[in-house]
């Protein structure tokens, strides 16, 4: 299925992408917490990886979709909101076999996806239910409906410094 | 095929402005961003900056942020790159590209000439 | 800003020879957790655009000869060119694709 807009570009068919099996750790954070690099606009904090100006948290606990929302919030952040294949690509070279929430969910009234910043999202979204309103990457190559209530891990995203 | 077709050679006043096209085929063009690179004669390259198309993101070398204004038009599948004041050191090659993450969309543009004289 | 500088800026072989070219990054290009270098070779012939030869730092585009390979990590990144053809006659750039994008210098590769 075409995860973004329909297309015969073969996006879902990449090179090389796919789980990351093994978790390998960041670089060594520098005692205030964050990881400083030369370069204007990088830094993270600690266990947080840079691409491209942002920063990405990936959660080992889990929690409903309500909870992860109060979490990236709490680290000033928000639930990862994956609107370019490059993003998505990113992030499925960095989660390992496992499910993560991400600020995408379904509005029922509308019978849209929706970002959690409002924008429409008109790509494809696998394994939909009814009582599932929520979406997480990670286990596959696409975006999965998920229940809202079910405990998943979290991507929270955030400008870095 | 994917193809970037770019608009042809310009010759402008210094403090005229110009606009550079690149037509976009053979791929969903919202789907990838698409960069500006420029090359002055017998120098290298140059990023100037991307437009996103998909999601409106746009970020630009700081050399250029004053210099360059990207914008793309999704119903042609067309990205333009305008350059304002120019002098003669705005002179080059510029080139339009695609690209992805896993960089299975690297494609160039044939590049446009711009030369600055009066 | 990442700076990205190649060396040497130019080179003279002759057909035949091994060649290698270098490129360095202010900081590293390497995301551990993600397995790669976002680092990417190109070759520019006369009048032509760039063409990708080699990214993630060693993984050679399709339809590239096996003659160029790259290796390194971190901030040390080298484009390795075996047996050169008068064909490769070419300047050769390296680009970082971690933070925004930059370009290298550049290195000419001239035949003798």
């Known amino acids: 299925p075409q995860i973004f807009n329909k297309s015969n570009d073969g996006f879902t068919t990449t090179r090389s992408y796919g789980t990351v099996s093994q978790i390998f750790g960041s670089s060594s954070p520098s005692p205030n917490g964050f990881i400083t690099t030369r370069s204007y606009g990088t830094v993270c904090p600690k266990d947080w990886e840079f691409y491209q100006a942002r920063c990405f948290f990936l959660s080992t606990s889990e929690s409903s979709w309500n909870e992860s929302r109060d979490f990236c919030k709490g680290k000033g952040s928000t639930l990862a909101i994956v609107n370019t294949p490059e993003k998505l690509k990113f992030l499925q070279d960095i989660t390992d076999a496992e499910k993560y929430f991400i600020g995408l969910i379904y509005h029922r009234e509308e019978k849209r996806w929706r970002w959690i910043n409002n924008s429409v999202f008109n790509g494809n979204v696998t394994n939909q239910n009814q009582n599932f309103n929520c979406a997480t990457i990670g286990l596959t190559k696409t975006f999965d409906a998920a229940s809202c209530d079910i405990s998943y891990r979290r991507i929270c995203e955030k400008n870095a410094k | 095929q994917v193809q970037l077709l770019q608009s042809g050679a310009e010759l402008v006043k210094p403090g005229a402005s110009v606009k550079i096209s690149c037509k976009a085929s053979g791929y969903t063009f919202t789907d990838h961003a698409i960069h500006w690179v420029k090359q002055k004669p017998e120098q290298g390259l140059e990023w100037i900056g991307y437009?996103?198309?998909?999601?409106?993101?746009?970020k630009y070398n700081e050399k250029f942020k004053d210099k360059a204004t990207l914008t793309a038009d999704k119903s042609s599948s067309i990205a333009y790159m305008q350059l304002n004041s120019l002098t003669s050191e705005d002179s080059a090659v510029y080139f339009c590209?695609?690209?992805?993450?896993?960089?299975?969309?690297?494609?160039w543009g044939q590049g446009t000439t711009l030369t600055v004289s009066s | 800003d990442i700076v990205m500088s190649q060396s040497p800026s130019s080179l003279a072989v002759s057909a035949g020879e091994t060649v290698t070219m270098s490129c360095k990054s202010s900081?590293?290009?390497?995301?551990?957790?993600?397995?790669?270098?976002?680092l990417a070779w190109y070759q520019q012939k006369p009048g032509q655009s760039p063409k990708l030869l080699i990214y993630w730092a060693s993984t050679r585009e399709s339809g590239v000869p096996d003659r160029f390979t790259g290796s390194g990590s971190g901030t040390d990144f080298t484009l390795t060119i075996s047996s050169v053809r008068a064909e490769d006659l070419a300047v050769y750039y390296c680009?970082?694709?971690?933070?925004?994008?930059?370009f290298g210098g550049g290195t000419k590769l001239e035949i003798k």
């Open positions: 437009i996103s198309p998909g999601d409106g993101d746009i």
């Open positions: 590209k695609n690209f992805d993450y896993d960089f299975i969309f690297d494609f």
């Open positions: 680009k970082q694709s971690y933070n925004l994008y930059t």
């Open positions: 900081q590293s290009l390497l995301n551990s957790r993600a397995r790669k270098n976002y």
